[in-house]
Interface confidence: low
């Protein structure tokens, strides 16, 4: 006769292995008992279990509630056990013993090997900004056995690596993700995929990408001159800008405070009915945690009574600050 | 029988630091991750990181990030969570927990009695 | 991260009743579900692990089920010790995340 069994049994993390031992014999042979034993280069030989034809199982008490037979029906020539809940210390080599009557004693070795499958965190990098250079913008990172795969899935032009730490019984690998960041990123998955044996589908964790910017800014408003006359209502200077994270508008009178009446409302500038009172430089000031840039505009109000007058108005420069 | 044994509680300043230990025994100490899980007075529990025992190696939560630092001495089975900068919403029962060998990353098989810690000026 | 969601926050049961709490998450966590028993004053409890599976030591009237986004706790017949606060947990991805608790009192 002889012992059916396998080289290799694969398990994923809490599962139950089953360790394979079929004796296969003539009709009138007969399996008196299988011993099983762990088989551990440093530690030696460990007992679990004897499975005898005529007293049953007997477990090791360290592996109590831990070794079991397969379900019935059972065949009388199958040695078999089922390890239950596998974890990662079961990895490693395992032996059964069969003795038979009258062909004797049988034995075999097989390795059985645990999938852990891993646990992936993402860990983001530092703020990015518009205008840095090459910048980690995640790290993920995921611990199983055997080695994980940890690769990136993006729209976003950019460059990966990755490096690996082998522990005794796991390895962690970790990627990172660097880019040149720039506004069109914000709001961009960076999706960090994790493959590995012991799962039945990928891992995903996503990053959306933000980055931080500040738009040069301009005011609208002005642009028909003939609208900037006395008596005039709903006229507005609007602020234009855009940024990452949103910016904050302010306005201010160049040559002195803003007249009264006139009400700041957000990115909006709004004058009541208009005077020449009303005529001067006035900037709107943007800002976020980044930066914050500047934009004046000369106005000034056309009196109809003195057409010599015409409504003149100057954008002047724009000024950036860098927080 | 596996135990986890924390050291007594501690009244802290807003400020200062905190380093809370866990002494395991009845297993192999340096076989299963240990965690530490906080729970504020009549709230709920909230993770904070894990140490590796045998490698040393951490992970925390994003939240504490910067303040946590966790450590193990394997000469004599325990494990410390060191918390710095300590406000007054620290103030919780800090418990130390065993990643379970099934699951190492995620479940806590056995817990210590808690530490609580108290920050007030 | 991962929220978790428990319903009811509070309940009142009567010994013997059949009680069930429900657990959502706010991705799908495969099985990578959680179930601790907490008592004032003292540290929690694995009851579940892995969605549906028994923590060793713990009685078989304790029983999870779902996958994915859903999970229930259900307790086939209430017993005086098992009046306490009882807590979902993801371990799909970190930062691992507890529900909010559901406080079983007695009615």
């Known amino acids: 006769g002889e012992l059916e069994t396998s080289d290799v049994v694969t398990v994923v993390l809490g599962q139950d292995a089953k360790l394979p031992c079929f004796y296969r014999g003539d009709p009138d042979e007969q399996v008196g008992q299988v011993a099983w034993a762990r088989v551990d280069p440093n530690e030696g030989i460990r007992e679990l279990a004897l499975l005898h034809s005529k007293y049953g199982l007997h477990v090791n008490p360290a592996y109590e509630d831990r070794v079991e037979q397969p379900p019935p029906p059972r065949d009388p020539l199958d040695g078999s056990v089922l390890l239950r809940n596998a974890v990662q210390a079961d990895e490693g080599e395992y032996e059964c013993r069969v003795s038979t009557f009258p062909a004797g004693s049988f034995q075999a070795r097989m390795r059985l090997r645990v999938l852990v499958p891993p646990l992936p965190s993402l860990n983001p990098g530092p703020p990015l900004e518009e205008g840095q250079g090459l910048t980690l913008a995640a790290s993920c990172t995921a611990e199983g056995s055997p080695a994980p795969s940890v690769t990136w899935d993006t729209e976003v032009k950019g460059t990966q690596s990755s490096r690996s730490f082998t522990h005794p019984r796991s390895a962690a690998v970790t990627s990172e993700f660097h880019l040149v960041p720039s506004r069109s990123m914000n709001g961009q998955p960076l999706t960090c995929v994790v493959s590995h044996p012991g799962l039945l589908q990928d891992r995903r964790i996503t990053h959306t990408l933000q980055v931080a910017f500040l738009a040069e800014a301009s005011v609208r408003g002005l642009e028909d001159q003939n609208l900037w006359q006395v008596g005039r209502e709903g006229a507005t200077l609007k602020c234009l800008s855009e940024g990452q994270p949103p910016p904050k508008y302010n306005w201010t009178r160049l040559d002195g405070p803003l007249p009264s009446g006139v009400r700041v409302k957000g990115d909006t500038l709004g004058f009541p009915p208009l005077t020449t009172e009303h005529s001067g430089v006035y900037v709107c000031h943007v800002s976020n945690e980044l930066s914050s840039r500047d934009s004046q505009v000369t106005v000034e109000v056309l009196d109809p009574e003195d057409p010599g007058k015409q409504v003149d108005l100057v954008s002047a420069s724009h000024h950036h600050h860098h927080h | 029988q596996v135990q986890l044994v924390q050291s007594g509680a501690e009244v802290k300043k807003p400020g200062a630091s905190v380093k809370v230990s866990c002494k395991a025994s009845g297993y192999t100490f340096t076989g299963y991750y240990m965690h530490w899980v906080r729970q504020a007075p009549g709230q709920g529990l909230e993770w904070m990181g894990w140490i590796n025992p045998n490698s040393g190696g951490t992970n925390y939560a994003q939240k504490f990030q910067g303040r946590v630092t966790m450590t193990r001495d394997t000469s004599i089975s325990t494990a410390y969570m060191e918390l710095s900068r300590l406000r007054s919403d620290d103030t919780a029962v800090y418990y130390c927990a065993r990643g379970s060998a099934l699951h190492f990353f995620g479940v806590f098989d056995y817990w210590g009695q808690g530490t609580l810690v108290t920050v007030s000026s | 991260d991962i929220q978790m969601t428990q319903s009811p926050s509070s309940l009142s049961a009567s010994v013997g009743d059949r009680v069930t709490i429900t657990c959502r998450a706010s991705q799908s966590i495969s099985s990578y579900l959680n179930w601790y028993q907490q008592k004032p004053g003292k540290a929690p409890k694995l009851l579940i692990y892995a969605a549906s599976s028994l923590q060793s030591g713990v009685p078989s009237r304790f029983s999870g089920s779902g996958s994915g986004t859903d999970f229930t706790l259900t307790i086939s017949s209430l017993q005086p010790e098992d009046f306490a606060t009882y807590y979902c947990?993801?371990?799909?991805?970190?930062?691992?995340?507890f529900g909010q608790g559901t406080k079983v009192e007695i009615k």
């Open positions: 947990q993801q371990s799909y991805s970190t930062p691992l995340t």
